[in-house]
Amino acid sequence: PRSIDVKYIGVKSAYVSYDVQKRTIYLNITNTLNITNNNYYSVEVENITAQVQFSKTVIGKARLNNITIIGPLDMKQIDYTVPTVIAEEMSYMYDFCTLISIKVHNIVLMMQVTVTTTYFGHSEQISQERYQYVDCGRNTTYQLGQSEYLNVLQPQQ
């Protein structure tokens, strides 16, 4: 068997809402993956599991099942959404994200994704993780790759 390539492209959109009573931020983050099947037979993308971390704390998880079948030597782009919650124990983040004196409220999130593919009863898992900028202050649509956090070192939060 040849490889199945998974490429995390980036954040496609981030939609934000607030609970002022709980001082909590809700971010619905839609991500884009490219999955390439280099084989001469079809493979099934069985599931995608994803999680988002902020400052080493998991703030959101998602799982998609029975997603798609990728034909021989084909590539599919898949969007998946992770609902995240920055809760009251990170109260300072509510202040930052709702601060009107700051115009771009970028926070650095670690996106982790695992894609499980199957073919002829064989299962394979491919994982990726990437740091991304997300604006927690307003709804934002990104051009693919625009939200990339380029610092190779783990950011200090």
């Epitope: 509510y94 202040d95 709702t98």
Partner: antibody, heavy 119, light 112 residues
Framework: EVQLVESGGDLVKPGGSLKLSCVAS????????MSWVRQTPDKRLEWVAT????????YYPDSVKGRLTVSRDNAKNTLYLQMSSLKSEDTAIYYC????????????WGQGTTLTVSS | DIVMTQAAFSNPVTLGTSASISCRSS???????????LYWYLQKPGQSPQLLIY???NLASGVPNRFSSSGSGTDFTLRISRVEAEDVGVYYC?????????FGGGTKLEIK
């Protein structure tokens, strides 16, 4: 209904001190940043202080830095402005205002309290 | 500091006709995120200021759609399509692109 009620305005001698208060009701006070804006006798508006919802971020213009201190007590739904080393140019109506993070500005203002600095 | 400039008085207008109030900033208020950080407030006689327009062209909640606003990065116009008696007061433009946030001197709407 959003309500902001300022109090504490008075006649003060130059060099004196005063503390203004603003009691908020009709909204979740702890979820909103707040500002103080003053209106001078010639009707000009001047922003003088901002405090974030949890008091993590505080901003002043250079003209009042070191003399004015903004604070808040979320348990009491109250915003404060402590003023010291007062000058005649601090004479104004002082308004407290709620910040709307969706609008990106102050959306509701109180009725104001008057400070007069004069000997 | 960003200086906001307004004429002290508008051209006198007749009730039911349209009025325009201008404001100019000393620096562009258009941010790289595409938002223009220009606001309009109305202070009616004996009252505190009330928000009319946020981020240059958006009507605040409860504001009649007789009000509209447009502009470039530095020149802005507030329009009232059919002036009513309750529109009388002083109109202030303001910016909060940069600290310190600053206001224009205000334009008093004059009725003929």
């Amino acid at each position: 209904e959003v309500q902001l009620v300022e109090s504490g305005g008075d006649l003060v001698k130059p060099g004196g001190s005063l503390k203004l208060s603003c009691v908020a009701s009709g909204f979740t006070f702890s979820g909103y940043g707040m500002s103080w804006v003053r209106q001078t006798p010639d009707k000009r508006l001047e922003w003088v202080a901002t405090i974030s919802s949890g008091s993590f971020y505080i901003y002043y213009p250079d003209s009042v830095k070191g003399r004015l201190t903004v604070s808040r007590d979320n348990a009491k739904n109250t915003l404060y402005l402590q003023m010291s080393s007062l000058k005649s140019e601090d004479t104004a109506i002082y308004y407290c205002a709620r910040q709307n993070f969706y609008y990106g500005c102050e959306d509701y203002w109180g009725q104001g309290t008057t400070l007069t600095v004069s000997s | 500091d960003i200086v906001m400039t307004q004429a002290a008085f508008s051209n006198p207008v007749t009730l039911g006709t349209s009025a325009s109030i201008s404001c100019r900033s000393s620096k562009s208020l258009l941010h790289s995120n595409g938002i223009t950080y220009l606001y309009w407030y109305l202070q009616k006689p004996g009252q505190s200021p009330q928000l009319l327009i946020y981020q240059m062209s958006n009507l605040a909640s409860g504001v009649p759609n007789r009000f509209s606003s447009s502009g470039s990065g530095t020149d802005f116009t507030l329009r009232i399509s059919r002036v009513e008696a309750e529109d009388v007061g002083v109109y202030y433009c303001a910016q909060n692109l940069e600290l310190p946030w600053t206001f224009g001197g205000g334009t008093k709407l004059e009725i003929k």
